[in-house]
């Protein structure tokens, strides 16, 4: 697992413990909470990041309301079960044996049940809509400049292949970033759109996951882009299975 050899740290994940005890004395970094070795040359999976976040006391956070068109992370933080590759296990359960099924970004996609609940497969989230509202500025940003800057950000900071940034929409003050990545499109080594979206979400909140880097300084032609509200919608390859009671609530 690559990491900065000089001081043995993980550039892409500060929620790790790194030590020069890897093969041949190389730097090896393990995610807090799970202890899984992580590849520091790319983003760490959202599941391992959530597990690391839950390994120490945290402040509760305010959540957005669920959308009727897509899944929104309305259940808040939980301590997830990750598979050996660091992905979310399809079925998640809490300490009181309440279980539910999640999608590939760890968002609940069924009603809650008991230990008998079956989640046959991990359903892929193939479309993520990041909805931002920026703080008032002297004038609207130039759409093509904004588009180019956000695409550059996802390519350079999050190492997401440009083909997965499907569109950037802008109607002042709302910015929408569409990420699309089908199972068939994702090749080995490609950053997952769910992981990129999570890193972006944490960056926007001033909680950068990168080691030793400054916080996110988003500028469009020198003008700061300051986000005051973020909503993230998740669309799965297979529609979620909620009871009518929830759907009509």
């Amino acid at each position: 697992h690559t990491a900065a050899q000089d001081n043995c740290t993980c550039p892409t994940n500060k929620m790790t413990v790194c030590s020069p005890d890897g093969p041949g004395g190389r730097c090896q970094c393990r995610a807090l909470g799970s202890g899984m070795a992580v590849d520091c040359s790319t983003l760490t999976s959202k599941c391992l990041l959530l597990k690391a976040r839950m390994s120490a006391p945290k402040n509760a956070r305010t959540l957005v309301r669920p959308s009727e068109h897509a899944l929104v992370d309305n259940d808040g933080l939980y301590d997830p079960d990750c598979d050996p590759e660091g992905r979310f296990k399809a079925r998640q359960c809490n300490q009181t044996s309440v279980c539910w099924c999640v999608n590939s970004v760890g968002v609940r996609r069924t009603d809650k049940g008991d230990l008998s609940l079956r989640c046959d497969e991990l359903v892929r989230t193939h479309h993520i809509l990041i909805d931002l509202r920026h703080r008032p500025t002297a004038g609207a940003f130039n759409h093509s400049d904004l588009d180019a800057e956000l695409r550059r950000l996802f390519r350079e900071r999050y190492r997401l292949h440009p083909k997965f940034v499907a569109a950037v929409h802008y109607e002042q003050p709302t910015i929408q970033i569409e990420l699309r990545q089908n199972t068939s499109q994702k090749a080995a080594g490609d950053v997952d759109i769910g992981d990129a979206a999570y890193y972006f979400e944490r960056d926007i909140k001033g909680e950068s996951l990168f080691q030793g880097r400054g916080g996110l300084d988003l500028r469009v032609r020198g003008e700061p882009l300051q986000v005051e509200r973020t909503l993230i919608y998740y669309l799965d390859e297979i529609p979620p299975k909620f009871s009518m009671k929830r759907l009509t609530a």
Epitope: S19, D21, P23, G24, G35, M36, D83, P84
Partner: antibody
Framework: EVQLVQSGAEVKKPGASVKVSCKAS????????INWVRQAPGQGLEWMGN????????NYNQKFKDRVTMTRDTSTSTVYMELSSLRSEDTAVYYC??????????WGQGTLVTVSS | EIVLTQSPATLSLSPGERATLSCRAS??????ISWYQQKPGQAPRLLIE???ESISGIPARFSGSGSGTDFTLTISSLEPEDFAVYYC?????????FGGGTKVEIK
């Protein structure tokens, strides 16, 4: 030569605490995890937790989480494992082990802790 | 937590025979497995790391294989000093866990 030297045998009463030490030498103390593993008489090996001496980050097996504390003293290259609220089933040999390349490469000689009223 | 199941619990063999010890993980752990030998009154001794990589100073008759969930420790020709208890251990994730052990005894 890498060496891990542990403190001597202890006899404790139920409810008491025990603190076992593990002094490391022959390598850069702060660079490698120290793990604690115990073995009850006639039983297998059980991992209790570990500590990274460089920053004192600890990780405990859930089974012992409320009773175990691991600390380190970099000035003496020593790691300590304290187990509280002892019960008879804690009678075991306690080993410290230095962790490298995904394996427990070096082991202390073991410390027998006997819990008896 | 990842559960490691070793089989058989006891292996009765004669010196010179081949010993095959098995370790099965409850989930895919790649090659994050190590093997240890323990004799009575002694601390365990590392034999194999990363499922198949030998440790310097360990006789060549000890070899490891496998990946994912099924792992094997093979002793090609048992020497008298090889009769002991053998443990597998995973370091894929915390908590690190050990198998229950296989005792190799003289037949």
């Amino acid at each position: 030569e890498v060496q891990l030297v542990q403190s001597g045998a202890e006899v404790k009463k139920p409810g008491a605490s025990v603190k076992v030490s593990c002094k490391a030498s022959g390598y850069t103390f702060t660079s490698y995890w120290i793990n604690w593993v115990r073995q009850a008489p006639g039983q297998g090996l059980e991992w209790m937790g570990n500590i990274y001496p460089s920053n004192s980050y600890t990780n405990y097996n859930q089974k012992f989480k409320d009773r175990v504390t691991m600390t380190r003293d970099t000035s003496t290259s020593t790691v300590y494992m304290e187990l509280s609220s002892l019960r008879s089933e804690d009678t075991a040999v306690y080993y410290c082990s230095s962790y490298r390349s995904d394996a427990f490469a070096y082991w202390g000689q073991g410390t027998l802790v006997t819990v008896s009223s | 937590e990842i559960v490691l199941t070793q089989s058989p619990a006891t292996l009765s063999l004669s010196p010179g025979e081949r010993a095959t010890l098995s370790c099965r993980a409850s989930q895919n752990i790649g090659t994050s497995i190590s093997w240890y030998q323990q004799k009575p009154g002694q601390a365990p001794r590392l034999l194999i790391e990363f499922a198949s990589e030998s440790i310097s100073g360990i006789p060549a008759r000890f070899s490891g294989s496998g990946s994912g969930t099924d792992f094997t420790l093979t002793i090609s020709s048992l020497e008298p000093e090889d009769f002991a208890v053998y443990y597998c251990q995973q370091s894929n994730s915390w908590p690190f866990t050990f198998g229950g052990g296989t005792k190799v005894e003289i037949k």
